[in-house]
């Protein structure tokens, strides 16, 4: 004959476990239900009364399957260098990404705790590590015989035209300039761009327990003057 | 554009009820909650209470709690508030206004308001 | 339920002065849920200020809002014609929610 089916709550046999979607309550000493992801416990089991579970107040959540008494707290709205990849809603805290243009400046467990903006290399410097979604922009000097004139974040030095007859010799900011109707060789016009990152990881501010009782952190970290990288601007 | 079309002016005598109605239009998110907002005269603003119109679920500040039901209908998108056992103190100006799931509350569209006057 | 007290009541001030308002909470907010919003006589109220410190669009850069745990403030850095209204700072920490009692600006 199958073994009977329990529901809940019901007192486990000695030494096993309770099934999926259930918990041991050490009040009740008996198997109890969770909730269900966007929903957290409103009473606690008792031996005769399973657990009641209610829906997740405005601007919190809970993902998973749980007991817990409250929901966890959305994390703040993005800030205005941020885009919201995800809603806050009843299963799901709020997302939020890094614009365009700019990378995760501080890092936590899961996402992005500030962003800034990617670097940008100043004419006679190129771009010799394209910025990411976690990483910035690193500059470096245009090599002899090469040329950057632009203020950028993605731009790196390109070679000077090779002239029959030079006119003005080119330098790290400035390309050369032939006297020649035609130069011998050239780069194609316009500036060479490097791909910009595209911000796809999750970013999304670590919950507070209780949105009741626990005020929410604002992270409001020093940007005080600090010396620019070399070959950068903060433009 | 995003709209919260309240319904107009009443004068109603003291005991009467009375049933007004507010249609929202231009919104694409459904996961929102529709507020109703009291002002008396000169007065402050005081929250009535609030329904999830995608569940029917309500919040009332206690003191509202048998004098205000609050319903709505999801085909219309319309949220009602119907106010009962009238006196002369819920003579007011009755405004709804939506706040988005998230955002902790920030009412950020109101209606126009409608103006109750109790009086026999 | 958590009362919001605003300070002052009704204040004057004149074109380009700095303007500071304060509602102070009777047990403690988080930051995210406490907001601010504009009413002029005949109008709906306005959302003004969301989450202690951010601006709606539309709203001027003038505005700003600071503020944790019980206390919290509006302040406007120069102060302008339209900016005469009053203003109500409302709580949705725990419910019931509750409006401060407003502060009416008034042009000096």
């Known amino acids: 004959l199958p073994a009977q089916v329990a529901f809940t709550p019901y007192a486990p046999e000695p030494g096993s476990t309770c099934r999926l979607r259930e918990y041991y309550d050490q009040t009740a000493q008996m198997c109890c239900s969770k909730c269900s992801p966007g929903q957290h416990a409103k009473v606690f089991c008792t031996k005769t009364s399973d657990t009641v579970c209610d829906s997740c107040e405005d601007s919190t959540y809970t993902q998973l399957w749980n007991w817990v008494p409250e929901c966890l707290s959305c994390g703040s709205r993005c800030s205005s260098d941020q885009v919201e990849t995800q809603a806050c809603t009843r299963e799901q805290n709020r997302i939020c990404t890094c614009r365009p243009g700019w990378y995760c400046a501080l890092s936590k467990q899961e996402g992005c705790r500030l962003c800034a903006p990617l670097r940008k290399c100043r004419p006679g410097f190129g771009v010799a590590r394209p910025g990411t979604e976690t990483s910035d922009v690193v500059c470096k000097p245009c090599a002899p015989g090469t040329f950057s004139n632009t203020t950028s974040s993605t731009d790196i030095c390109r070679p000077h035209q090779i002239c029959n007859v030079v006119a003005i010799p080119g330098n790290a900011s400035m390309d050369a300039v032939c006297t020649s109707t035609s130069p011998t060789r050239s780069m194609a016009p316009g500036a060479v761009h490097l791909p910009q990152p595209v911000s796809t990881r999750s970013q999304h501010t670590q919950p507070t327990p209780e949105p009741s009782t626990a005020p929410s952190t604002s992270f409001l970290l020093p940007m005080g003057p600090s010396p620019p990288a070399e070959g950068s601007t903060g433009d | 554009e995003v709209q919260l079309q309240e319904s107009g002016p009443e004068i109603v005598k003291p005991g009467a009820s009375v049933k007004l109605s507010c249609t929202a239009s231009g919104f694409n998110n459904k996961d929102i909650y529709m507020h109703w907002v009291k002002q008396r005269p000169e007065q402050g603003l005081e929250w009535i209470g609030r329904?999830?119109?995608?569940?029917?679920?309500?919040k009332h500040d206690p003191k509202f709690q048998d004098k205000a039901t609050l319903s709505s209908d999801t085909s219309s998108n319309t949220a009602y508030l119907q106010f009962s056992s009238l006196t002369s103190e819920d003579t007011a100006v009755y405004y709804c206004?939506?706040?988005?799931?998230?955002?902790?509350?920030?009412?950020?569209?109101w209606g126009q308001g409608t103006t109750v006057t109790v009086s026999s | 339920d958590i009362q919001m007290t605003q300070s002052p009541a009704i204040m004057s001030a004149s074109l380009g002065e700095r303007v500071t308002m304060t509602c102070t909470a009777s047990?403690?907010?988080?930051?995210?849920?406490l907001h601010w919003y504009q009413q002029k006589p005949g109008s709906s109220p306005k959302l003004w200020i969301y989450?202690?410190?951010n601006l709606p669009s539309g709203v001027p850069a003038r505005f700003s809002g600071s503020g944790s745990g019980t206390s919290y403030s509006l302040t406007i850095s120069s102060m302008e014609a339209e900016d005469a209204a009053t203003y109500y700072c409302h709580q949705y920490h725990r419910s019931p929610w509750t409006f401060g009692g407003g502060t009416k600006l008034e042009i000096k």
């Open positions: 989450s202690t410190s």
């Open positions: 047990s403690s907010v988080s930051s995210n849920y």
């Open positions: 329904i999830d119109p995608a569940t029917g679920n309500t």
């Open positions: 206004a939506h706040s988005p799931y998230g955002d902790f509350g920030a009412m950020d569209y």
